[in-house]
């Protein structure tokens, strides 16, 4: 079977995750995404940081980035709004909200995904699936296909400390285990899913990957809610 | 079209150093690594090192710690590689290359006494 | 660091003739790249992550193996496929490369 995948994870089986969206800068995938309402994609607000004068795009439907898919299509962005408190040198608040410039043709391959609204943390161990088509291997080779793996939440006593991300994941923030399975560069904005619910979207910070004492970091949708819901009104 | 273009060929003096950049066109070098791998004449390939310049991490291999220095430059998507206090083992030809897939076309760097 | 060897170093083969060219690892490693390199030319990728082909690489190579021992395979020789092999391994730093299987045409 294929190995190295998102980092130590695997092809995720084709078009299983209809939620998943590629954030796309000039025609090439830039972030991960995940819809959220018929009209909106949520994903990174680094992720536009070089965007500047780029045509963004959202590819949703689609398993492979450069296959024909009958379920794939690309959608013009409307509107993109950052959180207003995201800056760029820091993780905090990395969150962007992207409006389509239509309604998402809804489908088997092409659903929103129900996102978690009761701010309380996912319990430490719990397996979460993380699924974008960042690097997947130390060489920085880039998948054509969508990879996933499933991680362990860390607690954030853990995550905190000194040696790991020392005080740096506030309440708003969560970590998943990062021991050669991980996220990385290109999976930043996608979707953190825990039992069928997102829970965290990927950072966008620049960060080693597969290494245990980095973590992963994701932002905690639920502690957006207000944010996410005054946007999507 | 992804491409790598690396500067020309380098002569230089033993002790000397030098510095040699490849330049990055059709892709963003922040998407991924850059690698610089050293090919002595007649002789295979050797991994020097890589740079993520999303962040500037590097890893090299411990046998070229000291003796190469790899940096990138984001805003002209080049990457570049540094030998210093050069000798005769350092002749050799130097390539980048991107997650390995895309290559230079190598910068053949002479060390005269 | 993990050392590849490669055999044998040198071998030759006829136009349509079967070659297969290993690449044993001194420690288990779990996944390895093979290269293409033909004089005076940069290296080439023919395969990733041990068996997938590389873009615009014909399908008569192929990769496989596990563990410590992994092979390249190019099913019919051709004239344009005599070239120095070279594979190499993704799992541990730093990244070691073999020292090379240089194949001849026969």
């Known amino acids: 079977p294929p190995r190295g995948r998102i980092l130590g994870g695997r092809e995720a089986e084709a078009h299983a995750r209809p939620y998943m969206a590629s954030v796309q800068l000039n025609g090439a995938h830039l972030c991960g995404g995940v819809l959220v309402a018929e009209q909106w994609v949520l994903s990174a607000a680094h992720c536009l940081e070089d965007a500047a004068d780029g045509k963004v795009q959202v590819l949703l439907g689609a398993h492979s980035l450069s296959q024909p898919e009958p379920s794939k299509r690309l959608y013009d962005v409307l509107r993109a709004v950052p959180h207003p408190d995201s800056q760029p040198d820091t993780i905090d608040h990395d969150l962007l909200l992207l409006q389509l410039s239509e309604k998402a043709t809804l489908g088997p391959a092409v659903r929103p995904l129900p996102w978690q609204r009761v701010d309380r943390d996912v319990a430490p161990g719990t397996l979460c699936d993380v699924a974008g088509w960042g690097i997947v291997n130390h060489a920085g080779r880039r998948p054509d296909s969508l990879q996933h793996v499933l991680l362990p939440v860390l607690d954030r006593a853990t995550c905190n400390r000194r040696t790991h991300h020392d005080g740096a994941i506030t309440e708003r923030l969560m970590c998943a285990e990062s021991n050669r399975r991980d996220s990385c560069k290109g999976d930043s904005g996608g979707p953190l899913v825990c039992g069928g619910v997102l829970e965290g979207v990927v950072t966008s910070g620049s960060r080693v990957c597969g290494n245990r004492k980095k973590p992963g970091i994701y932002t905690r949708v639920a502690s957006y809610a207000a944010w996410i819901d005054s946007v999507l009104a | 079209e992804v491409q790598l273009q690396q500067s020309g060929p380098e002569l230089v003096k033993a002790g000397a150093s030098v510095k040699m950049s490849c330049t990055a066109s059709?892709?963003?070098?922040?998407?991924?690594?850059m690698h610089w791998v050293k090919q002595r004449p007649e002789q295979g390939l050797a991994w020097i090192g890589r740079?993520?310049?999303?962040?500037?991490?590097?890893k090299y291999d411990p046998k070229f710690q000291g003796k190469a220095t790899i940096t990138a430059d984001t805003s002209s998507n080049t990457a570049y590689l540094q030998l210093s206090s050069l000798t005769s083992d350092d002749t050799a030809v130097y390539y980048c290359?991107?997650?390995?897939?895309?290559w230079g076309q190598g910068t053949s760097v002479t060390v005269s006494s | 660091q993990i050392v590849l060897t490669q055999s044998p170093e040198i071998m030759s083969a006829s136009p349509g003739e079967k070659v297969t060219m290993t690449c044993s690892a001194r420690?288990?490693?779990?996944?390895m790249y093979w290269y293409q390199q033909k004089p005076g030319s940069s290296p080439r990728l023919l395969i990733y992550?041990?068996?997938n082909l590389a873009s615009g690489v014909p399908v008569r190579f192929s990769g496989s193996g596990s563990g410590t021992s992994y092979s390249l395979t190019i099913s019919r020789m051709e004239t344009e496929d005599a070239a120095t092999y070279y594979c190499?391994?993704?799992?541990?730093?730093?990244?070691?490369f073999g020292s090379g299987t240089k194949l001849e045409i026969k």
């Open positions: 290359t991107s997650a390995m897939d895309y």
């Open positions: 059709g892709f963003n070098i922040k998407d991924t690594y």
């Open positions: 740079i993520d310049p999303a962040n500037g991490n590097i």
């Open positions: 420690s288990s490693v779990s996944y």
């Open positions: 992550d041990t068996s």
């Open positions: 190499q391994q993704w799992s541990t730093y730093p990244f070691t």
